[in-house]
């Protein structure tokens, strides 16, 4: 679709005459009548195909003829078309005589030709003015013409439609060539997808305006290049959506079970050393000098009563001193200068000559102890608690401080790890010697049943265009992540496509 | 329907005068210009005169001029020929004709009507 | 004054092509009508302008103008085509007619 455009320049009548040479009374009232046509060799009558055009009376005789284009007016001549442009034309341009102001034909008289003139040739599509100058025995006319395409259509023939817009079905300009040229932040061949954000994942991440950065279910950050892990995940990472995949030292379905006391809590003190041995259980090591679960409490070298024969202990820095009664010597004071005679021992103890009397051993009665019947017994030192439970004297008797996890008056059992219902979904808890074990129920699975087997809701295969589906074990419902290039909740739409196009 | 008819034609003497009637139908008469055509018996067709809309324009050809008068009555819608001085070589067919706008020519034609001019 | 030369007589045959020429200096740059006369009948307009036809006149007669010579064609021509034909233009005094040209179909 194009205009032709023919500008009248000026048309010369001296003699003021038609083009049989008649006179014209009062003069020539000129007006013109243009017709445009296919291309011929020898420009012939017939139907004007291209298009026809009259003007008023523009001058009588010879005159000038303004160009009125910014004014709206008739001058260049519009001969619009609504073709591809041929690159050929025929021109035929007649001047006529209206005595009157009715330019219809049949109002004219008989013979009101002044002149016409008839071109033809080739013209292409451009803005450049092509002038011309037809001379005949007693006129002559001056004028220009071109092709130019109609708004909207561009290209050597005025054949391609470009209009320009910024909406739902492209965001562009159109080149000289019609070509588009998209808008800052738009791509395509339509430049209806917009640029994301600079480094916005490829698959992950979408938009729907330019420099946005929208992710794809699973994904999250800036760039959506962080997958989410599964919901209720702790202490765990994912590399594909819905992963929860455990840090070290965490177990469990959302990686929040402790596997490693020791590091994540540092539960031993006084530089003791530490050893996991369970889920949220741990032994401690203790050093020289220290005792307790966590090796919290300072030992005295003298608590272990290490002077015999009533030695008295005394500590010092690098360790123990043992100040030993009359008759007794040696480091714990376990040499006796002492006899039977000498009655040595204590708290009802028995005497036993040894040695032809150069010795003696004491029989204690119950409850004491030591060479000389001197120490009560302590319960503790047989260390009779179990599983690392702390052994406390309490007069007469001892008493277990157990570990968590353990009871009994030696510590020796277990805490009932079923004791807190952990089997879900009405799973079956049994207790084993380190830990637990649930038998799950039909349709359940997993260390605590809490996995839901009898609904897969990604058996039905319901995402579309190749995504990948994942169960929402949660909820019992699926997440599909989509591929690159489709949106939804199935990935049923492709991005940024409308259905069809209006053009 | 469209039509022109011719009257007044016959035999005249040399000199004298004779008046040709065309009478229009079946379209606008006092929007066209008018003209008379003759033929000669035998012979080609020859522009005798003719007349704007309303009657303010009047063309001859030579040989007629002076001698020959054309006018019309857009009330009667009819043109009239005034011939006089008649001669021999006017010996012809009279025809009224339509003279079309804007160089078509001579669209509508009268049957014709014949006059003789002889001693 | 402006003379308009036809050949007296064109003969063709039926179905054929028949030419007619009307010649005169420069008439490319004026309109020629052609006429049509059959014997004892009025003149017809069958081409005005060059080469367009009136309603009612067969496609089989056309005309064109250029230089000096107009030419009104027959094409197909038939017995019925069989007449007189005059081309007419105008000059500084009126309407002028040529010669005629007398067409015979054989």
């Known amino acids: 679709s194009g205009v032709f455009q023919l500008q009248l320049q000026e048309f010369i009548n001296e003699r003021g005459v038609l083009a049989s040479g008649r006179p014209c009374e009062p003069g020539c009232r000129t007006f013109f009548r243009v017709c445009l046509k296919h291309f011929q060799a020898v420009v012939s009558p017939g139907p004007c195909t291209f298009g026809t055009v009259s003007t008023p009376v523009l001058g009588t005789n010879s005159f000038a003829v303004r160009d009125d284009s910014s004014g709206g007016g008739r001058n260049p001549l519009q001969l619009p078309f609504n073709f591809t442009w041929p690159g050929t034309f025929s021109l035929i341009i007649e001047a006529w005589h209206a005595p009157g102001d009715d330019l219809r034909p049949e109002a004219l008289p008989p013979d009101a030709l002044i002149s016409k003139i008839a071109i033809q040739g080739s013209l292409a599509v451009g803005q450049n003015w092509l002038l011309d100058e037809q001379t005949s025995t007693l006129t002559r006319l001056r004028y220009s013409y071109r092709v130019i395409c109609s708004d909207n259509y561009y290209g050597d023939n005025c054949s391609r439609l470009c209009k320009k817009r910024n909406d739902h079905f492209g965001h562009y300009v159109c080149q000289p060539d019609g070509n588009l040229s998209c808008l800052p932040g738009w791509t395509g061949e339509y430049c209806q997808q917009p640029i994301c954000l600079s480094g916005c994942h490829e698959q992950n991440g979408y938009c729907s305006k330019p420099a946005e950065c929208l992710c794809r279910p699973g994904w999250q950050g800036r760039l959506c290049n962080e997958c989410i892990p599964h919901n209720g995940c702790r202490h765990g990472t994912c590399s594909t959506p819905w992963q929860c995949t455990c840090d070290e030292g965490w177990g469990g379905l959302f990686c929040d079970q402790d596997l490693n006391y020791c590091t994540h809590h540092s539960p031993c003190k006084n530089g003791a050393t530490c050893s996991n041995s369970g889920q949220r259980s741990y032994t401690c090591t203790c050093r020289p000098g220290y005792t307790g679960v966590d090796c919290e409490l300072e030992l005295s070298e003298c608590d272990s009563n290490p002077c015999r024969n009533g030695g008295s202990c005394k500590d010092q820095e690098d360790g123990y001193h043992c100040l030993c009664p009359p008759g007794y010597y040696g480091l714990h004071c376990e040499h006796s200068t002492l006899s039977c005679a000498d009655s040595p021992c204590f708290n009802g103890g028995s005497c036993r000559e040894r040695n032809q009397g150069a010795n003696y051993a004491c029989e204690c009665p119950p409850n004491f102890t030591g060479s000389n019947c001197e120490k009560k017994v302590d319960r503790c030192t047989s260390n009779p608690c179990a599983n690392g439970g702390q052994c406390l004297n309490r007069g007469p008797s001892r008493m277990c401080r157990c570990r968590p996890g353990f009871t009994g008056t030696y510590c020796e059992l277990h805490v009932s790890d079923c004791a807190r219902n952990p089997c879900a979904h009405g799973g079956t808890c049994h207790d084993l010697e380190n830990g637990l074990m649930c038998t799950c129920p039909a349709g359940f699975s997993g260390r605590r049943c809490e996995v839901r087997t009898s609904i897969d809701a990604c058996a039905s295969s319901p995402c579309f265009n190749r995504a990948t589906c994942y169960t929402d074990l949660s909820t019992d419902t699926f997440v599909c992540n989509c591929p690159y290039g489709f949106v939804g909740s199935r990935c049923e739409f492709p991005v940024g496509l409308p259905p069809s196009f209006p053009w | 329907e469209v039509q022109l008819v011719e009257s007044g034609g016959g035999v005249v003497q040399p000199g004298r005068s004779l008046r040709l009637s065309c009478a229009a139908s079946?379209?606008?008469?006092?929007?066209?210009?008018m003209s008379w055509v003759r033929q000669a018996p035998g012979k080609g067709l020859e522009w005798v005169a003719d007349?704007?809309?309303?009657?303010?324009?009047?063309y001859y050809a030579d040989s007629v001029k002076g001698r020959f008068t054309i006018s019309r009555d857009n009330s009667k819608n009819t043109l009239y020929l005034q011939m006089n001085s008649l001669r021999a070589e006017d010996t012809a067919v009279y025809y009224c004709?339509?003279?079309?706008?804007?160089?078509?020519?001579?669209?509508?034609w009268g049957q014709g009507t014949m006059v003789t001019v002889s001693s | 004054s402006y003379e308009l030369t036809q050949p007296p007589s064109v003969s063709v045959s039926p179905g054929q092509t028949a030419s007619i020429t009307c010649s005169a200096d420069?008439?490319?740059?004026?309109?020629v009508s052609w006429y049509q006369q059959k014997p004892g009948q009025s003149p017809v307009l069958v081409i005005y302008?060059?080469?367009n036809r009136p309603s009612g006149i067969p496609e089989r007669f056309s005309g064109s103008n250029s230089g000096n010579t107009a030419t009104l064609t027959i094409s197909g021509t038939q017995a019925m085509d069989e007449a007189d034909y005059y081309c007419?233009?105008?000059?500084?005094?009126?309407?002028?007619f040529g010669g005629g040209t007398k067409l015979t179909v054989l």
């Open positions: 079946g379209f606008t008469f006092r929007s066209h210009w």
């Open positions: 007349i704007s809309q309303d009657g303010s324009y009047k």
């Open positions: 302008q060059d080469g």
């Open positions: 004709a339509r003279a079309a706008g804007g160089n078509v020519g001579f669209d509508i």
């Open positions: 420069k008439l490319g740059t004026k309109y």
């Open positions: 007419q233009s105008w000059d500084q005094s009126g309407a002028v």
